[in-house]
Each structure stands twice: as structure tokens, then as C-alpha cells.
Interface confidence: low
């Protein structure tokens, strides 16, 4: 079954900056990726970026740079400042839509024991939504 992985890293050089990387392990082509924080989009989360393979990328503060890393993975840099600054226990979620194969969403946050600039390798996260 396809899975989504989420990796969150705090930048060593800027402690208020985060890098979120998400990947889709399925075989289908991706039609839309939505990145949110504070929980899943639609369940209290706030959308940070939407990436469409043909129509481009849209992002909202404090997202600084969203981009495709591969055909099935994306990265997003967050630059915290003031009220919109992420904190260490912020939850970030990525939803990959690959209809009709399905839509999959997974969430992650900074590992509690992580030092700035360090992170665990990406690991598959639970499938939260599928069709």
C-alpha cells in the first residue's frame, strides 16, 4: 500500500527556520500535494503550500520556499518570525493526491531529542487517508 513519509528538520544556522520534506512511496502519478501545519488540512490545520505538477506552486507565510525535489517528493522551508513562527513541537502534515489510486496524508514533527540541523532519515509514516 502506498505510504507518505514526512521529515522535519530545524536549520542549524537559523533556529527559527524549519525544512519539511515529504515523499510519496506509491506508484501513481501525483495530482496535488498540500502541506499544512498544526494538524491535517481540514482538521484544524493551516495550509502552508499547495504544489501542482502542472499549474505550479502556491505558498503562504511563513512558508519561504516550496519546491519539487523529485516527481514524488517535495520540500518546504519555513522562516519563523513573530506570531507565525513555528515551534519545536509543531506538527506538519503532507497530503499527496494520486486519484484514483488514492489520497494519502501523514504528519510529523521535530524529533524531541533532535539537535538543530540533525534529523532522522525519512521513514514511512502511517497512511491516514486512502482511496
Amino acid at each position: 500500500t502506498p505510504e507518505v513519509w514526512v521529515q522535519v528538520r530545524m536549520e542549524a544556522t537559523e533556529l527559527s527556520s524549519f525544512t519539511i520534506r515529504c515523499g510519496f512511496l506509491g506508484s501513481g502519478s501525483i495530482s496535488l500535494v498540500t502541506v499544512s501545519w498544526g494538524g491535517p488540512n481540514g482538521a484544524g490545520g493551516t495550509t502552508l503550500a499547495v504544489l501542482h505538477p502542472e499549474r505550479g506552486i502556491r505558498q503562504w507565510a511563513p512558508a519561504r520556499q516550496a519546491r519539487w525535489e523529485t516527481q514524488s517528493s517535495i520540500s518546504l522551508i519555513l522562516e519563523g518570525s513573530g506570531a507565525s513562527s513555528p515551534c519545536a513541537n509543531t506538527t506538519f502534515c503532507c497530503k499527496f493526491a494520486s486519484f484514483p489510486e488514492g489520497s494519502w496524508e501523514a504528519c510529523g514533527s521535530l524529533p524531541p531529542s533532535s539537535d538543530p540541523g540533525l534529523s532522522a532519515p525519512p521513514t514511512p509514516a502511517p497512511i491516514l487517508r486512502a482511496d
Epitope: T1, S31, L32, P40, N41, G42, A43, T47, V50, H52, E54, R55, A97, F99, P100, G102, S103, E105, P126, I127, L128, R129, A130, D131
Partner: antibody
């Protein structure tokens, strides 16, 4: 063949409660997100709840948040919608549906809220 | 919330004709729009998803197009069994929202 069969509809007074069920067959229920959608007497469609495949996450529009609760029992291949503090505007045909967008729909169960 | 507007409540054509049903989103939803068909006394059925992709078993006379805020469902070679209400829905953001529906009448 994908089949979805709703039950539990009926008449209830304003402020009352009702639980709808949706029995699923013909596919691996635990692998799919599921939703409830309703259709008013004026035939307007409104999505009212969604639950993730494992039941971890639930989603609602503002119109039903705090009054409706979606849940599922993957061992029984059954989806539920618990409705409380019902209002006259909740009168509708309630459908369960698979996926996002909604690839398969049940035949619906009618809920009537009236004094 | 994204408001989906179908400005025409009714459209009419003859058997064998061609008809276009339009839908407008209140904001850019990229290509995340689906179309449903609901025949009298039946539940809705998914025809098109992601603007232009036909769902399983949908005849190729049904075609979807558009992007951003303006979307169209076109039925070529309309058949008598196509008599139904057609509704659009955005699957871009939560809450998922539907248009009010357009009824296809056969002359």
C-alpha cells in the same frame, strides 16, 4: 462490486439524536477514507463529515462541527454518523461515500427533523 | 469556503446533440474539480475527477475541461439516459463544496 448500504434514518424532533450506519462490502474497507454527504429536500448536496482510513483523523464543515461525530469500525466494515442537537435544516437524504472525490455512493437514508 | 456556482439550472438539447454545463469556483482551485451525475431516484455517480479524468466505466462522450475558476462538462452525442442533474464539486480544499446542479432536459 463496491456496495455501500446506509441505515438508521428516520424522524426525530429538533434537539434529538440519531445514529446512521453504513455497511460496506466489495472492497478493503480499512484502506479507504470515507465520507457522509447529505442532500437537502431542495436537492443541494453538502459534505458533512470525513474519516481517514484508520479512523485517526476526522473532518467536518462548520455547519455540523460539535454536533456530528463520524466514526468507523474496520473489523465490522461499518461507518457511522452520530448526530445530536438536530435542527430542521438537518433534514436530508444522507449518503455514505468512498474516497475523495467521492467515487462510490450508497443509496441513502432519509433523516427528517420536525416538531 | 470555496463557493461553486452553476449559473444555469437547466440546459436542453436533442438526442444526439451536444451540451456544455459550466461551473465557476469563487477562488482558484487549480484542476481539482469533479463532476457527478444524478439520475431521478438514484444516488449521485462520479463522472469526472481532477477536471478531465473520466472515472471507471464512464462513456467517452463525457468530457471535462477548465482550470483555475472556470470549468465545463461537455456531453457529446447526448442519449436519452443522460437525463439527469449534473453537479460540480471542488476537491481542492476542505470543506469539500458542491455546485447547485444543472438539470439536463431532452427535447
Amino acid at each position: 462490486e463496491v456496495q455501500l448500504q446506509e441505515s438508521g434514518g428516520g424522524s426525530v424532533k429538533p434537539g434529538g439524536s440519531l445514529q446512521l450506519s453504513c455497511a460496506a462490502s466489495g472492497f478493503t474497507f480499512s484502506s479507504y477514507g470515507m465520507s457522509w454527504i447529505r442532500q437537502s429536500p431542495e436537492k443541494k448536496l453538502e459534505w458533512v463529515a470525513e474519516i481517514s482510513s484508520g479512523g485517526t483523523y476526522t473532518y467536518y464543515p462548520d455547519t455540523v462541527t460539535g454536533r456530528f461525530t463520524i466514526s468507523r469500525d474496520n473489523a465490522k466494515n461499518t461507518l457511522y454518523l452520530e448526530m445530536s442537537s438536530l435542527r430542521s435544516e438537518d433534514t436530508a437524504m444522507y449518503y455514505c461515500a468512498r474516497g475523495d472525490p467521492f467515487g462510490y455512493w450508497g443509496q441513502g437514508t432519509l433523516v427528517t427533523v420536525s416538531a | 469556503d470555496v463557493v461553486m456556482t452553476q449559473s444555469h439550472k437547466f440546459v436542453s438539447t436533442s438526442v444526439g446533440g451536444r451540451v456544455s454545463i459550466t461551473c465557476k469556483a469563487s477562488q482558484d482551485v487549480m484542476t481539482a474539480v469533479a463532476w457527478y451525475q444524478q439520475k431521478p431516484g438514484q444516488s449521485p455517480k462520479l463522472l469526472i475527477y481532477s477536471t478531465s479524468y473520466r472515472f471507471t466505466g464512464v462513456p467517452d462522450r463525457f468530457t471535462g475541461s477548465g482550470s483555475g475558476t472556470d470549468f465545463t462538462l461537455t456531453i457529446n452525442g447526448v442519449q436519452a439516459e443522460d437525463l439527469a442533474v449534473y453537479s460540480c464539486q471542488q476537491h481542492y480544499s476542505t470543506p469539500r463544496t458542491f455546485g447547485g446542479g444543472t438539470k439536463l432536459e431532452i427535447k
